[in-house]
């Protein structure tokens, strides 16, 4: 025999059940929106201090490079790979061709202002790149010098100089006070090393390692 | 679109999907009890109303032969 | 954790949530369903069982005096 | 010891022109990058131009540009300097100068006396 | 081009005192540890001769009471204790780039 609830009873279980199902709803919303919070604000913060960090490096470029040009490397939004507008890309560096007749000294100067170096050509397929970008009637400074006149010769960002990686001109280097190299073109040999005189005024090739944001 | 504004579209539908479903399925149970009282009250206690098996999230309808 | 990996967990949880709620809500309309048909049985025809009212996306228990 | 001996300067009419030669001893001069520079009575020095050793560059200032030519005979240890054109702002005391190199830029080690060319009509 | 600016134009000292020449550049004439400025000394109807190479560097021959100093754009040539000898015109020189260029020059005179 099942005892008979009283109408009050039951009104009052009711109740009871409403507010037990109504707060789970709350909770399981609650923790919906705590999981949804967290993953809109959190990537949001993390995004914005991504992008402070960003912009705080842009700034540090902005003085010599008012504008960049960016590509996405792989998948992922986050990394971006840049050069100096003007400047080429080639694997993990930028180039830049300064037309202006300077000495090898003022050349190298001018490429540290942007924030890089005259060119190390460390590959084949590196010159192969460069020598498209460069006019046949003109020679173009390297950051390779022998100041010693000693021929040690030896690249301005310190790595070291590699005898089987080089391409000098048949004959070159040929005179102990030509200190400083150019990249030129011979018509017999293409394009090739040479050494001269470090002030005489030539064009320059300046290379950057990419900026990544 | 890029693949994290996909994730972050997805992630909104789900929500609130997610919400919805929450209400309907709450709707749905106070309902299923209600409905189990008035069916008790109307018959004149030929039914003994919802019984909660073993806490389940669910309940299902009870039927039972009213005490004679 | 990365930014789009957060995104993707919370994927995962709220696809997860989603399921499980849809399930439950789905099992629990089968049971009124199938109580209702029970119901209408045993009792001889007392109770019609449910009726879809609007086509709603939840149902109630309609009782009601079967015709005489 | 090194010794570097100037000749050639003299008295000329504008447009007119000189050669100065420089005769060198003492050394390899074939080894040598070699320089004029010039001295206008009163006033301080004025390079002219330079040869490099192996006479594969020249250099001049844009003062004479296309009027002078630096040139050397490494068999006879000279060097020359070939004026045309000359104008009275090119009056001075002419030098020959070796060369020597230092890290990325060079000195004048030695220097001739000097050889007088007055530009006047 | 690079011009190179000398002060005093005139110095007026005596025997046995010490002298202090500069030399200006306009713009930097060093390269990292290289600082390429020259100084040399000319005295009436004579050729110039080299004192000081590379700003420190004493050419050999020349009396250790010479000395040079500096780096970027200014330079210094010092004689501890002027000798009667040492009284003449001294130059100061550039060659980091072309052209090469000369101050006007200090003329150190007996007072």
């Known amino acids: 025999m099942v005892p008979e609830e009283e109408p009050q009873d039951r009104e009052k279980g009711l109740w009871w059940f409403q507010l037990k199902v109504w707060s789970m709803a709350v909770v399981s919303i609650l923790l919906l929106s705590v999981c949804f919070t967290v993953s809109s604000v959190v990537p949001h913060n993390f995004m914005y201090s991504k992008t402070v960090k960003r912009l705080s490096k842009l700034r540090e470029y902005q003085q010599y490079h008012p504008s960049l040009t960016c590509v996405m490397e792989g998948k992922d939004i986050e990394d971006w790979s840049c050069c100096p507008t003007p400047w080429t890309s080639f694997q993990s560096s930028c180039y830049f061709i300064s037309t202006g007749m300077q000495s090898w000294t003022k050349s190298q100067k001018n490429c540290s202002v942007m924030g890089a170096d005259l060119v190390v050509i460390n590959t084949r397929e590196e010159q192969d790149f460069i020598i498209q970008n460069l006019k046949r009637n003109s020679s173009y400074f390297l950051g390779l010098s022998d100041p010693g006149g000693r021929r040690h010769w030896q690249w301005v960002d310190q790595t070291p100089y590699n005898e089987n990686v080089t391409f000098w001109h048949s004959g070159e280097p040929n005179n102990l006070d030509e200190r400083c190299a150019i990249i030129n073109f011979r018509s017999s040999e293409e394009w090739g090393w040479n050494d001269i005189h470090c002030h005489v005024p030539q064009k320059s090739i300046c290379k950057m390692k990419k900026i990544y944001i | 679109l890029g693949e994290p504004q996909l994730c972050y579209i997805l992630d909104a539908i789900l929500f609130l999907y997610g919400i919805v479903l929450t209400l309907l399925y709450c709707r749905l149970k106070i309902q299923v009890r209600k409905a189990a009282i008035t069916s008790y009250e109307k018959s004149d206690g030929v039914y003994t109303g919802l019984s909660t098996r073993n806490q389940e999230t669910y309940e299902t309808l009870k039927h039972e032969k009213p005490p004679q | 954790l990365g930014e789009p990996q957060l995104c993707y967990i919370l994927d995962a949880i709220l696809f997860l949530y989603g399921i499980v709620l849809t399930l439950l809500y789905c099992r629990l309309k089968i049971q009124v369903r199938k109580a209702a048909i029970t119901s209408y049985e045993k009792s001889d025809g007392v109770y019609t069982g449910l009726s879809t009212r609007n086509q709603e996306t939840y149902e109630t228990l309609k009782h009601e005096k079967p015709p005489q | 010891e090194v010794q570097l001996v100037e000749s050639g300067g003299g008295l000329v009419k504008p447009g007119g022109s000189l050669r100065l030669s420089c005769a060198a001893s003492?050394?390899?001069?074939?080894?040598?990058?070699m320089s004029w520079v010039r001295q206008a009575p009163g006033k301080g020095l004025e390079w002219v131009s330079t040869i490099s050793s192996g006479d594969s560059y020249t250099y001049y200032p844009d003062s004479v540009k296309g009027r002078f030519t630096i040139s050397r005979d490494n068999a006879k240890n000279s060097l020359y300097l070939q004026m045309n054109s000359l104008r009275a702002e090119d009056t001075a005391v002419y030098y020959c100068?070796?060369?020597?190199?230092?890290?990325?830029?060079?000195?004048?080690?030695?220097w001739g006396q000097g050889t007088t060319v007055t530009v006047s009509s | 081009e690079i011009v190179l600016t000398q002060s005093p134009a005139t110095l007026s000292l005596s025997p046995g005192e010490r002298a202090t020449l500069s030399c200006r550049a306009s713009e930097s004439v060093s390269f990292r540890t290289s600082h390429l400025m020259h100084w040399y000394q000319q005295k009436p109807g004579q050729a110039p001769r080299l004192l000081i190479y590379?700003?420190?560097n004493l050419e050999s021959g020349i009396p250790a009471r010479f000395s040079g100093s500096g780096s970027e754009t200014d330079f210094t040539l010092t004689i501890s204790r002027l000798e009667p000898e040492d009284f003449a015109v001294y130059f100061c020189?550039?060659?980091?780039?072309?052209?090469?260029?000369f101050g006007g020059g200090t003329k150190v005179e007996i007072k």
């Open positions: 590379g700003a420190s």
């Open positions: 003492g050394f390899t001069f074939s080894s040598y990058g």
């Open positions: 020189q550039q060659s980091i780039e072309d052209p090469p260029t």
């Open positions: 100068a070796r060369q020597i190199y230092y890290d990325y830029a060079y000195y004048f080690d030695f």
